[in-house]
């Protein structure tokens, strides 16, 4: 019988054979970490000769080559060192910005053994655009340098690098770029499980968070997040069973999928799971149309019963047919529920494709993805209703371009990955939804639908009142702590008489809580600068209230995300090593940052926070206020860097009773408190008993309106001191 020659050793590496030296056997080379095999594999032909994929000569000497990371092609508004053509494993590249530009991202990055840079793309930004500067990832070239609403930027990769992410991005109305950051990678690069798990987990937890979570329950077998909502999640698991997947790999695919199912069901959301194995044809083991798809035991049973031999007659990889079977399932469900019904439109869909190679039959899988996007009506508004995760396993035949084409593109998220082997995949699924890490992290979720009540839109918002009239506002930052202004308590009233009114789904009037303790910043003293002719000074205007009982989380009561915490980091979908500075650069990244506060009547009002040079011109108006500050020489004596400034242009101004309320912004459909309402030069509610009545200041008013808000980024030491065991703070 014909067999292939055995002189195929690789210097410095090892090889395995799928079927010995016989024709049809695949020889796969592997090298120690930090090296990659060239070629990666050979196939034993029926002629008894080894064939190397994409090689001109039939047999080149196999070698282990050193992995290298791509060099920057260009770096705007700054410099990088050292300047090399590519970088060795362990090599660093450092970035610095020119004057007037702030560095966002990682100032130093290191080349890792998988051919990927650690950290984040460094960007030198001056915050002038409607969207932040999207940067240029290492190895990429960008065309387009305007960052206004509707502007587009395009990316391509240099030489033989492969682009993953979005080749084109558009600056959207919400100040966020469409799609996901493009990364240029070596064709032989792969992802480490420790990078994929948090990336997948963060994206998934965002999807779960968007399902309007309510109560967390403690159970005897570990903690669970209980998520009750009107909507539903359909999870479709697609497992490659083609010839190139070994029985062993198929087993680990099954175990990984079971882990995923187990984790998802532990969130007690309304979930249906479909299981599809595929080779030349798909086989639906569980459909979302089957009532059993909602039962974890039945779903895991159908996974367990998936047989490796189910596809032994069809050995190709028909990814199109697998995705098309998902499309058909969706189509059937739509017909069943009715296309126009909320029951259909409120279902979120997540597809996880586990494959070991490129699709080699059945046509382009992208066609099926386009059909799926169309049937689900996926547009900018409904982008959150579909997530496709494309996970390639094994570095051999996996096609980066195809995976990237199939995976969803969402800002700050990754949906396409390549892992070294199935064991790496299993590690990812073990850690991606570690419930213990996610239980307390769902903050900043507000219901954005048109028919939501004001309280459902801003469920962190609370009213703080003494026995009689209402005085201040505040924000829930955990299930027992409220952040508010210190000046609310300046009369030194016994806080045992005060009440905090928190949203409650059972009552339009909310629910009243007693205060266990008030922690008022010791630095706050409204008369501290009286002898300098400053009649009122609001430095350190911050306080925390601990409620006498924990608040039951609901659609009407939920904490807002505090920046510089792990909880906010998850909501921002940032990598694990992020710092407080990273959060400030991401949230306050323009000279004029759109933000909101809550009015006395509960509605959400708009302001623009002025940063950088615009902060200076915003604050300077205070010198015209002669009543409160009769002989002010330096505005900074009153408006210290503890304050954010708003009130220019079309901004609304807060009323007196709105002090202490959150100044917040929206990022990626989650809400983050960056400040709290402190003081201002104009009270639009003065002289009005009606909560709904606000008077705009006349244009001729001197001084014009200005509002100042305590900047939470400047209060970090105090917040950490008092909330260190309540929230998980990031390094500064």
């Amino acid at each position: 019988a014909t067999s292939c020659p055995q002189n195929v050793n690789i210097s410095g590496g090892t090889f395995t054979l799928s079927h010995g030296w016989a024709p049809g056997s695949l020889l796969i080379y592997s090298c120690p970490q930090g090296l990659y095999p060239s070629p990666a594999s050979r196939l034993c032909k029926s002629s008894g000769q080894w064939q190397t994929p994409r090689a001109t000569r039939s047999l080149t000497k196999a070698v282990c080559k050193p992995v290298r990371c791509p060099a920057p092609v260009s770096f705007e508004n700054g410099i990088y060192t050292p300047r090399l053509g590519s970088y060795p494993v362990g090599g660093n590249v450092s970035f610095e910005c020119e004057d007037g530009f702030i560095l966002r991202g990682s100032p130093v990055r290191q080349c890792r053994p998988n051919g990927m840079w650690d950290g984040e793309t460094a960007v030198c930004d001056n915050g002038a655009g409607h969207c932040p500067n999207p940067g240029i990832s290492l190895g990429a070239v960008r065309t387009g340098s305007r960052f206004g609403h509707g502007d587009k930027v395009r990316y391509r990769c240099s030489s033989n690098l492969v682009l993953t992410g979005s080749a084109e991005r558009e600056c959207q109305g919400n100040g966020v770029w469409s799609g996901t950051e493009p990364i240029c990678r070596q064709p032989y690069s792969y992802d480490f499980p420790e990078d994929v798990a948090p990336a997948l987990g963060t994206s998934f937890s965002h999807m779960l968070g968007a399902t309007n979570p309510t109560q967390r329950t403690k159970e005897s077998l570990g903690r669970k997040i209980q998520i009750q909502r009107s909507g539903h999640l359909n999870l479709y698991l697609l497992l490659d069973s083609s010839q190139s997947v070994s029985e062993n790999d198929f087993l680990i695919f099954k175990e990984s999928a079971s882990l995923m199912v187990d984790r998802i069901f532990s969130f007690e959301i309304n979930v249906s799971v479909a299981i599809i194995t595929f080779a030349s044809e798909p086989k639906v083991l569980m459909s979302v149309l089957n009532v059993n798809s909602r039962d974890i035991t039945e779903v895991i049973s159908s996974l367990e019963n998936a047989k490796y031999k189910d596809h032994e007659n069809g050995t190709g990889t028909n990814t199109y047919a697998a995705l098309n079977s998902v499309y058909l399932m969706m189509n059937n469900q739509m017909q069943l529920l009715g296309m126009k019904t909320m029951a259909w439109q409120e279902i979120r869909h997540a597809i996880i494709l586990l494959t070991d190679g490129k699709s080699n039959m059945g046509g382009s899988p992208k066609t099926a993805v386009d059909q799926i996007r169309e049937i689900l009506n996926i547009n900018q508004k409904r982008n959150d209703y579909l997530d496709i995760y494309a996970i390639g396993v094994g570095k051999l035949d996996v096609d980066w371009r195809e995976l990237n084409e199939l995976g969803s593109k969402k800002d700050g998220e990754r949906h396409a990955f390549i892992l070294q082997d199935t064991k790496a995949l299993h590690q990812v699924f073990e850690h991606m939804l570690d419930v213990s890490k996610l239980t307390d992290t769902i903050c900043g979720v507000g219901n954005m639908s048109a028919n939501a009540s004001d309280q459902e839109r801003t469920p962190w918002h609370v009213t703080i009142k003494p026995k009689s009239q209402e005085t201040c506002r505040g924000a829930l930052i955990s299930d027992q702590w409220v952040l508010t202004a210190a000046h609310c308590f300046r009369d030194g009233n016994d806080h045992s008489l005060w009440r905090v009114n928190v949203g409650d789904p059972k009552s339009q009037w909310g629910k009243e809580f007693l205060i266990e303790k008030a922690v008022i910043s010791p630095g706050f003293d409204v008369f501290a600068k009286k002898n300098q002719g400053i009649l009122e000074f609001y430095g350190d205007d911050i306080a925390l209230l601990k409620l006498a009982q924990k608040v039951k989380m609901s659609t009407h009561a939920r904490p807002i995300c505090l920046p510089c915490t792990m909880e906010a980091n998850l909501a921002l979908r940032r990598p694990q090593g992020s710092t407080c500075r990273d959060h400030e650069n991401e949230l306050l990244n323009k000279q004029s940052v759109p933000a909101h506060f809550v009015a006395l009547n509960g509605s959400k009002l708009n302001i623009n926070l002025k940063m950088g040079v615009e902060w200076t011109s915003c604050a300077e108006v205070v010198s015209q206020e002669k009543t409160m500050f009769p002989n002010l020489t330096d505005v900074r004596e009153v408006v210290t860097d503890q304050f954010l400034c708003s009130g220019t242009q079309e901004d609304e101004s807060p009323c007196k009773g709105e002090s202490g309320g959150a100044v917040f912004l929206e990022r990626r459909f989650r809400f983050f408190q960056v400040g709290l309402v402190s003081w201002g030069l104009y009270n639009p509610c003065l002289g009005s008993a009606d909560k709904n009545s606000r008077k705009r200041a006349p244009r001729s008013k001197v001084p014009p309106p200005r509002d100042f808000h305590i900047n939470l980024f400047r209060m970090q030491p105090w917040l950490r001191q008092h909330l260190g065991d309540v929230l998980n703070f990031l390094p500064l």
Epitope: E247, E255, L259, E304, H426
Partner: antibody, heavy 119, light 108 residues
């Protein structure tokens, strides 16, 4: 605390039958792959049989195929091994073990029950 | 049925490092568990999924698995570590496979 407690062992004549039980506690029994492993006196560990979480998938060592039947009752958190046509070489301590969800990666063992086949 | 091969015995002086190997075809692609069994007692998991140590198992126990060989390493071996050690993985067609066992002797 995760625990597996075997029972049902004892002395039986060749050709006889015995049913072993394994009561599980401290984990969600219905989610996990379970198996029986035995150890003849002075010998090593030998896998006997395994069963998937729902009971739909079963596997047996060649030495017991056709004679032993593994089953489970998820409502009672109990694993069973029905042993028929017993032989002298089946004499061993029988251990019940918990695997992964579909993999036989054992992470918990029972204390074992002794089965002696002798006339 | 695919077999796992272990050395029948390994001897080590107290405080030294003991290494027990387990070999099998493409073993690195599978997960390996290691069990410790002392006379008259049931087995105890010391390593699972190649490298994971259950709570309560001392840090001196570690595992690795690549190519065709899995290794159990006991650094700073103590007298109490004297026992039989078994490796285990899965084979084709749903079967489970155990190594023949290695008797670890800690020299007095």
């Amino acid at each position: 605390e995760v625990q597996l407690l075997e029972s049902g062992g004892g002395l039986v004549q060749p050709g006889g039958s015995l049913r072993l039980s394994c009561a599980a506690s401290g984990f969600t029994f219905s989610r996990y792959y379970m198996m029986w492993v035995r150890q003849a006196p002075g010998k090593g560990l030998e896998w006997v049989s395994s069963i998937g979480s729902s009971g739909g998938t079963t596997n047996y060592a060649d030495s017991v195929k056709g004679r032993f039947t593994i089953s489970r009752d998820n409502s009672k958190n109990t694993l069973y091994l029905q042993m028929n046509s017993l032989r002298a070489e089946d004499t061993a301590t029988y251990y019940c073990a918990k695997g992964g969800m579909v993999l036989g990666v054992v992470n918990i063992w029972g204390q074992g029950t002794l089965v002696t086949v002798s006339s | 049925q695919s077999a796992l091969t272990q050395p029948p015995s390994v001897s080590v002086s107290p405080g030294q490092t003991a290494t027990i190997t387990c070999s099998g075809d493409k073993l690195g692609e599978k997960y390996v568990s290691w069990y410790q069994q002392k006379p008259g007692q049931s087995p105890v998991v010391v390593i699972f999924q190649d490298i994971k140590r259950p709570s309560g198992i001392p840090e001196r126990f570690s595992g690795s698995n690549s190519g065709n060989t899995a290794t159990l390493t006991i650094s700073g071996t103590q007298a109490m570590d004297e026992a039989d050690y078994y490796c285990q993985t899965w084979g084709t067609g749903g079967i489970q496979v155990f190594g023949g066992g290695t008797k670890l002797t800690v020299l007095r």
